[in-house]
Interface confidence: low
């Protein structure tokens, strides 16, 4: 039977009284419009809530916004609208919260049509006080903080100027005109594209890529014929137009654009796109769209330089540019990613990789579930996960998959069990081992969140009717208790808990509706008294991640090392606490063929660990472009997976020889790049 409140479930004692004493209601003195919520800092308890309400008048729309602040994780709120002079705040810019624990907040105000520039309100004390600043430009984008220094801000203006502030928005300087896109890199570097003839859209494919490392004192052109650019991990990518036609190629740099190499990826045409699905300092997952309006493409994984790519997954579901993909990084276990493929019959199936894209498989069928109508064989089927694509298709899926780095091994997702994703109402499934095995956790769609590093899971049923019940589990979703948090049901709009899953507080947001008005309301529930004591050593057990065969000496080896974690026992009802740190012990593994990707020109046949030569490249010299020189690759088909720490064992030979020939790349070679100073 599905897990629930059966005899095996140990009930949490007196939980109703404990939760009732820790349930805090706040009714907002607002007409219902839109509400946005931001956490300011980590473990500060500070929440800002911005409510906005538009009153459509005959000629124009009149707007009103209110700002509220809590410093106790949402239990109490104070109206601080007067701190921003009762100004209407533009919700499309949201609340720009500073990095780390800087305590900085920027709100962008709505200003009247004829004004010279925009207006912002700035706080650097966790929104206790705000300073009004009038801008010398109208912002087009939200203020962007430098990741290294929260005093440095950049913004684009409606006239495509690039503006920079070095004193947290007090004073602004336009450092460049005709800018399309700007991004902070590392070390306070700014990368941006510029157009020459008229507009960003008109010059797409003829843009220039620029860099400034001194906030606009001097500039360097690092690329021409640019279509777009992106940053991922330590890699800088640019999609560059080819000389002869309308195709584009990806070029990559690992030195901030000083030198570039052409990525060994297929070129794309006008209607196609590239997308960086995930990137870290070791490698990149790149999606390359198929020609035509297919809705799918191919995932490639890079080597440690971002240059040589291996085909990772075919028929990867990704609708048009900026569209939907289900690609999900499972942050609760190293090396695990989930995504969807579009099969030949146009059904959508979920695939999972446990080794950072080396091999993909279907998700194992949950033991407590039956195969649905999509399954040809009622005894053999898989779990299929609903993610962004299902949500975009308006299926009854309120939330994407959820995992948290400090809730080791836990993955929660909506899904269906069959041969493909079903349009039927989904159930909620949980994995406690990073996606290897799954169990049905809740019947029907729910909102869910993880508290206390996995010590508590909270869920609320997704319903069109008003609700007043919350469910919670202290044993990773095996057993559930229900708590009625209010006598009067509310129209539920969202669950909010502090990012990072360390908190024991959950806020339930919604609105009440009466004949005349509707008002925003929040209920914040603190679970601290449910988890009465702090966890001790006896509450934890040793767990070997990625373990599939305990008899095997190499069991648990993924990317060259295995990790043992201390994990909370399901039967322990105790607090991990805000200071909980994941305890893990890694150990290096001997290298096997699993620690190698197939090199350029090679592929891995299904269910085989050996790499074989691609038929179309057999007998050809493998030549590729590196830093503008042509290289000759002598390989027996393998290259070490980026980030793989294995030592010894099998280690196939691979060599790269410089052919001392120039590549035929139309990209700027380093010697042609120019610099200039302001």
């Amino acid at each position: 039977s599905a897990p629930g409140e059966d005899e095996e479930c140990g009930r949490v004692r007196d939980f109703v009284a404990k939760l009732a004493n820790n349930t805090h209601q706040h009714v907002f003195d607002d007409l219902r419009g839109s509400v946005s919520l931001s956490w300011v800092g980590d473990s500060t308890g500070v929440i800002l809530v911005l409510t906005t309400f538009h009153v459509p008048l005959v000629i124009m729309t009149f707007g009103q916004s209110k700002l509220y602040r809590s410093e106790d994780y949402g239990k109490n709120f104070k109206d601080i609208t007067d701190l921003i002079n009762n100004t209407f705040i533009r919700t499309e810019f949201g609340m720009a919260i500073g990095p780390e624990n800087s305590g900085k907040v920027v709100l962008t105000a709505e200003v009247s049509g004829g004004s010279r520039g925009g207006r912002i309100f700035r706080s650097s004390d966790f929104a206790k006080n705000f300073v009004q600043t009038d801008l010398p430009f109208h912002p087009l984008t939200q203020m962007m903080y430098s990741p290294q220094n929260s005093d440095y801000l950049l913004a684009l203006s409606t006239e495509n100027g690039l503006w920079v502030s070095k004193n947290f928005g007090g004073k602004w300087e336009e450092i460049h005109k005709a800018v399309c896109l700007a991004k902070w890199g590392s070390d306070n570097t700014i990368f941006f594209t510029t157009y020459a003839n008229g507009s960003c859209k008109a010059d797409l494919g003829a843009l220039e890529l620029w860099r400034t490392s001194d906030l606009g004192k001097s500039f360097k052109t690092i690329g021409v014929k640019i279509y777009s650019f992106g940053l991922g991990g330590r890699f800088l990518f640019a999609s560059v137009m080819a000389d002869k036609d309308t195709t584009r190629r990806i070029h990559v740099s690992t030195d901030q654009g000083d030198t570039w190499s052409m990525a060994q990826l297929p070129s794309v045409g006008q209607e196609q796109f590239y997308s960086i699905l995930a990137a870290n300092d070791d490698m990149v997952f790149m999606h390359v769209d198929e020609p035509g309006d297919t809705g799918f493409g191919t995932i490639f994984t890079s080597d440690d330089r971002g240059i040589v790519y291996s085909k990772s997954l075919d028929r990867h579901l990704y609708t048009t540019t900026g569209g939907e993909t289900d690609f999900t990084n499972v942050t609760s276990l190293r090396g695990v990613y989930i995504t969807s493929v579009l099969s030949e019959d146009n059904s959508i199936q979920t695939m999972i990789t446990f080794d950072q894209g080396g091999r993909w498989t279907h998700l194992r069928k949950p033991e407590n579930s039956e195969c649905d109508a999509t399954a040809k064989n009622k005894n053999e089927c898989s779990l299929h996960i609903h993610a962004s694509y299902s949500i975009s298709q308006k299926l009854n899926v309120p939330m994407a998959p959820l995992s948290e780095p400090n809730a080791v091994g836990i993955v929660i997702a909506h899904g269906s069990v069959g041969d493909a994703i079903s349009v039927m109402v989904p159930d909620v499934y949980i994995s406690d081992d990073g996606g290897y095995s799954w169990t049905k956790m809740l019947e029907g769609p729910h909102y869910y969140t993880i508290l206390d590093s996995g010590g508590i899971i909270v869920a609320i049923e997704h319903s069109s009717r008003p609700i007043n019940v919350i469910k919670f589990s202290t044993d990773e979703g095996q057993c559930w208790q229900t708590y009625t948090f209010t006598r009067d049901p509310i129209y539920f709009t969202g669950l909010a808990s502090e990012p990072g899953a360390r908190s024991m507080n959950i806020s339930i947001w919604g609105f009440t509706e009466s004949f005349l008005t509707s008002q925003w309301v929040s209920y914040t529930i603190d679970f601290k008294d449910i988890l009465e004591r702090n966890c001790e050593e006896k509450d934890y057990t040793i767990w070997l991640a990625h373990s599939t065969d305990p008899e095997d000496y190499e069991d648990g080896c993924i990317l060259g090392y295995k990790e043992q974690f201390l994990r909370l026992r399901k039967s322990s009802v105790c607090q991990n606490g805000r200071d909980y740190v994941v305890t893990k012990q890694p150990s290096i593994c001997l290298c096997s063929l699993e620690d190698f990707l197939c090199d350029f020109g090679y592929y891995r046949p299904e269910n085989d660990s050996k790499c074989v030569e691609q038929p179309e490249l057999k007998g050809h010299d493998l030549e590729f472009c590196l830093y503008g020189r042509e290289e000759h690759l002598t390989t027996n088909g393998y290259r070490k997976i980026p980030g793989d720490k294995c030592q010894g064992g099998v280690n196939p030979v691979r060599e790269v020889k410089d052919l001392k020939k120039k590549c035929t790349s139309n990209f700027l070679s380093p010697e042609k790049q120019n610099s200039k100073s302001n």
Epitope: Q585, S587, I588, Q647, G648, G649, N651, E655, V656
Partner: antibody
């Protein structure tokens, strides 16, 4: 039986160069990382260099980078250490060792290098 | 770089004694540590790898223990052939894979 035999040691002038060799037998040479370790007279062991099985990856301590170069020829089952700009403090017995991962499991008998005028 | 502090630097003991040599590391190396034995004029010999595993052919009177930053090599019931110098070496992460400074075990 695993065997590692170093050669090429001897007397070299300060600023001079020397190339050490290590002949391997009794195991599949091209699937193992290999290392050089040295020991100055009366002193402890000092790691000098490591090379991956295919020869692609090389590692050195910072103080030796640029002066020492480790290389291998898998066809000849041989490991090499090229020493340039010799200094008195390079005087030591140099050992080659098989390096399968978390240890150096087999060592040669060593070859003595003396840097002196 | 990871620093290795081996102690004691020298030690006198008698045949049949139980001897302990410790190696303290400047950061957690997650048991990626090896112990070697070296006799005068000879090459080092691997005794223990991964902190606790005996290498092939090493007598069971040798044992390794420890985790995190503190590791120990123990010799139960010293034999005459055990008098030598012992070194620890870490293999965690990227190089340099430093050795400890050595412990000379002498006959009392």
């Amino acid at each position: 039986e695993v065997q590692l035999v170093e050669s090429g040691g001897g007397l070299v002038q300060p600023g001079g160069s020397l190339r050490l060799s290590c002949a391997a037998s009794g195991f599949t040479f091209n699937i193992y990382g290999m290392s050089w370790v040295r020991q100055a007279p009366g002193k402890g062991l000092e790691w000098v260099a490591t090379i991956s099985s295919g020869g692609i990856y090389t590692y050195y301590p910072d103080i030796l980078k640029g002066r020492f170069t480790i290389s291998r020829d898998n066809a000849k089952n041989s490991l090499y250490l090229q020493m340039n700009s010799g200094r008195a403090e390079d005087t030591a017995v140099y050992y080659c060792a098989r390096h399968p991962g978390g240890a150096m499991d087999y060592w040669g008998q060593g070859t003595l290098v003396t840097v002196s005028s | 770089d990871i620093q290795m502090t081996q102690s004691p630097s020298s030690l006198s003991a008698s045949v049949g004694d139980r001897v302990t040599i410790t190696c303290r590391v400047s950061e957690n190396i997650y048991s990626n540590l090896a112990w070697y034995q070296q006799k005068p004029g000879k090459a080092p010999k691997l005794l223990v790898y991964a902190a606790t595993n005996l290498a092939d052919g090493v007598p069971s009177r040798f044992s390794g223990s420890g985790s995190g930053t503190d590791y120990t090599l123990t010799i139960n019931s010293l034999q005459p052939e055990d008098f030598a110098t012992y070194y620890c070496q870490h293999f965690w992460g990227t190089p340099p894979w430093t050795f400890g400074q050595g412990t000379k075990l002498e006959i009392k």
